[in-house]
């Protein structure tokens, strides 16, 4: 019976060698892809000298094949019943799966440029900077490839620099070869509620990017969950992308290859301003961009991207306020395609299908010192690209799913 | 509050070099440029170069360059140039002058004269 | 490198009376020039920064004005403790440099 049931799931979910959750956990099982859309940038000069709307118009999808690296490092830890591990970075570009290829150029934001002006404030580093730029003629916007944007370049700017500074800048950089973590997850042994849950990342319990509850590391990595989610969860999960933890409320009941699922999405709220939810007031870390914290729907990561002035969002800056995209032409925000969701199976809490959906911004100030933006008038918080990072269970997989699992159950 | 004490006067002989001082306190000394003036008597100021103590950042003016060299220690809260290679040429009063935010030489040194003289 | 030239050199002027220095800059400096008092035996004091503020503290009979390359400060009213040199400071690009100085005397 439903007894006998619960006690194979509960034995069949804990992450030690020979568990089927396991086996899918240290390499997952599901091809992941990532899409990415860049905004390309289409008046720079207008903008450079008249602070005009930035105009972008998206190109993509560009695709890559991700998380197919197994775990490594993989070390359970039976005094606390943890297992931790190294999740290595890897990706390959699928020319099938995109619109053209790494070597296709791009007008974007000049990232050396954006974020030296807002890490080095000083007026005299500004001017010294201002001489550098000048003399590598860069400017404010710049042409690089796919390849260049993602994974590196060496910006002629940075290069001339006469202090220590990284030479090399890519939204992305560096990736392959990298690995996230160490995690330090409960392996479910002694209580599977508490199974995949983080217990620290990097050796902490906390972010130290963020003041009070916000610093906190919560839930999983969303790959998985505790078994036998109800719909009336509020299911906490860390994203090292986004430099936080967030959550995920149920949304409808899907059919997924035969297997019912939940859908779970990240509601609006989780972006809104402290004015609307004052659970966000520590995500909120300084007051000039945000207008006093009442902009909402983009987060400024600068603490966790050593001062470089990141911002990430929602695609084309679903659920963020008026302000944010009011300088931005080209936007055209839908939940369907923007928003973020994971497909739950409830029994086993494993994610059988997501869409992780995110957007790299930048803030990019007028400065006085700097020639290439002396003329703006306005703070842009500006779109460079975003992504659709996808996994689905495969056919074969989610025949054993439902054999093994939820058709035992019905 | 902001106080910028220099090193006293130097007599010194050409072709030898000289090391003048520049203690501050009351601010946060890595936050904010030194720089160094020159005034030759009864004439004008020039600039002779600044340093950003947070980064190391130095500039120094393409007429001084090879002549001061610019340096900080951190843990005193002091700022230094050396001038080498002396001449009559660089007699003169030497100051140090700090930033404050968008402020040019918003604070000086009472300045240091160095007499060039065989 | 910009220069700044500064006139008129010297300057006496009665007590009460309007003083004008003018300062002109080799290239378009926006407003960014500063100006500065120097009296005798001290360092320099700033009394107006970019954009033609006047610094806390400083009386409001001087003032400042001008962009561009052409630049004009005034004090209103002379006063014997006016009696110093002043100078201009462009800070638009590096190196930073000053006009040669006004001398203002007492009449």
């Known amino acids: 019976g439903d007894l006998l049931i619960q006690k194979t799931i509960k034995k069949q979910v804990v992450l030690e060698e020979g568990t089927i959750a396991f086996k899918n956990w240290v390499k997952t099982g599901t091809e992941v892809y990532r899409q990415f859309w860049i905004f390309d940038v289409q008046n720079p000069q207008e903008v450079m000298m008249n602070s005009s709307n930035i105009q972008v118009k998206q190109r993509g999808p560009y695709t890559y094949r991700v998380r197919f690296l197994a775990k490594e490092n993989v070390t359970q830890d039976a005094e606390d019943n943890t297992v931790s591990f190294l999740q290595p970075n890897g990706a390959i570009f699928e020319p099938s799966l995109s619109v053209g290829t790494e070597a296709d150029n791009f007008t974007v934001l000049n990232l050396a440029v954006a974020a030296a002006s807002h890490i080095y404030q000083n007026q005299f580093v500004q001017m010294i900077l201002n001489s550098l730029i000048n003399k590598s003629k860069s400017s404010m916007f710049q042409v690089r490839t796919l390849r260049e944007l993602l994974w590196g370049y060496r910006d002629p700017f940075l290069s001339l620099v006469p202090y220590p500074v990284t030479t090399t800048v890519g939204l992305f950089y560096p990736y392959n070869n990298t690995a996230d973590g160490v995690y330090k997850v409960f392996n479910g042994k002694d209580n599977i509620s508490k199974v995949a849950i983080i217990d620290t990342y990097k050796g902490k319990r906390n972010l130290s990017y963020w003041e009070s509850h916000c610093d906190m590391i919560n839930g999983t990595d969303a790959a998985s969950f505790p078994p036998f989610v109800e719909k009336s969860q509020v299911l906490q999960f860390f994203s090292s992308d986004i430099c936080r933890s967030i959550y995920a409320v149920f949304e409808s009941d899907v059919n997924l290859k035969g297997i019912p699922v939940y859908r779970f999405v990240l509601p609006s709220k989780a972006f809104a301003s402290p004015v609307e939810n004052p659970d966000n007031y520590c995500f909120c870390t300084e007051k000039i961009i945000s207008k006093n914290c009442t902009s909402y729907g983009v987060l400024d990561i600068s603490k966790c991207k050593e001062g470089r002035p990141v911002y990430i969002s929602l695609p084309h800056f679903l659920y963020a306020s008026p302000d944010v995209s009011e300088p931005i032409d080209g936007l055209n925000p839908n939940e369907e395609e923007h928003r973020t969701y994971l497909d739950i199976e409830p029994i086993t809490g494993f994610t059988l299908q997501f869409a992780k959906r995110l957007q790299v911004n930048l803030l990019v100030k007028p400065s006085e010192k700097i020639q290439v933006l002396k003329n703006l008038k306005r703070n842009y918080i500006v779109p460079i690209l975003w992504l659709n990072e996808t996994g689905t269970i495969g056919d074969e997989k989610a025949n054993m799913f439902r054999s093994q699992v939820t058709g035992k159950i019905n | 509050q902001i106080q910028l004490v220099q090193s006293g006067p130097e007599l010194v002989k050409p072709g030898a070099s000289v090391k003048i001082s520049c203690e501050t306190s009351?601010?946060?000394?890595?936050?904010?440029?030194m720089h160094w003036v020159k005034q030759s008597h009864g004439k004008s100021l020039e600039w002779i170069g600044g340093i950003y103590p947070n980064n190391g950042a130095t500039k120094y003016n393409q007429k001084f360059k090879g002549k001061a060299t610019l340096t900080v220690d951190k843990s005193s809260s002091t700022a230094y140039m050396e001038l080498r290679s002396l001449t009559s040429e660089d007699s003169a009063v030497y100051y140090c002058?700090?930033?404050?935010?968008?402020?040019?030489?918003?604070?000086w040194g009472q300045g240091t004269l160095v007499t060039v003289s065989a | 490198e910009t220069t700044v030239t500064q006139s008129p050199a010297s300057l006496s002027v009665a007590t009460g009376e309007k003083v004008t220095i003018r300062c002109i800059t080799s290239?378009?400096?926006?407003?960014?020039m500063n100006w500065y008092q120097q009296k005798p035996g001290e360092p320099p004091k700033l009394l107006i920064s970019?954009?033609?503020t006047l610094r806390p503290g400083v009386p409001s009979r001087f003032s400042s004005g001008g962009y561009g390359t052409d630049f004009v400060f005034t004090v209103e009213n002379m006063l014997s403790e006016d009696v110093a040199d002043y100078y201009c400071?462009?800070?638009?690009?590096?190196?930073?440099?000053f006009g040669a100085g006004t001398k203002l005397e007492l009449k």
């Open positions: 009351g601010h946060t000394f890595t936050e904010y440029t």
């Open positions: 400071l462009q800070s638009d690009n590096l190196p930073l440099t």
């Open positions: 290239t378009d400096i926006d407003d960014d």
């Open positions: 002058a700090r930033d404050r935010y968008d402020v040019w030489f918003a604070y």
């Open positions: 970019e954009g033609n």
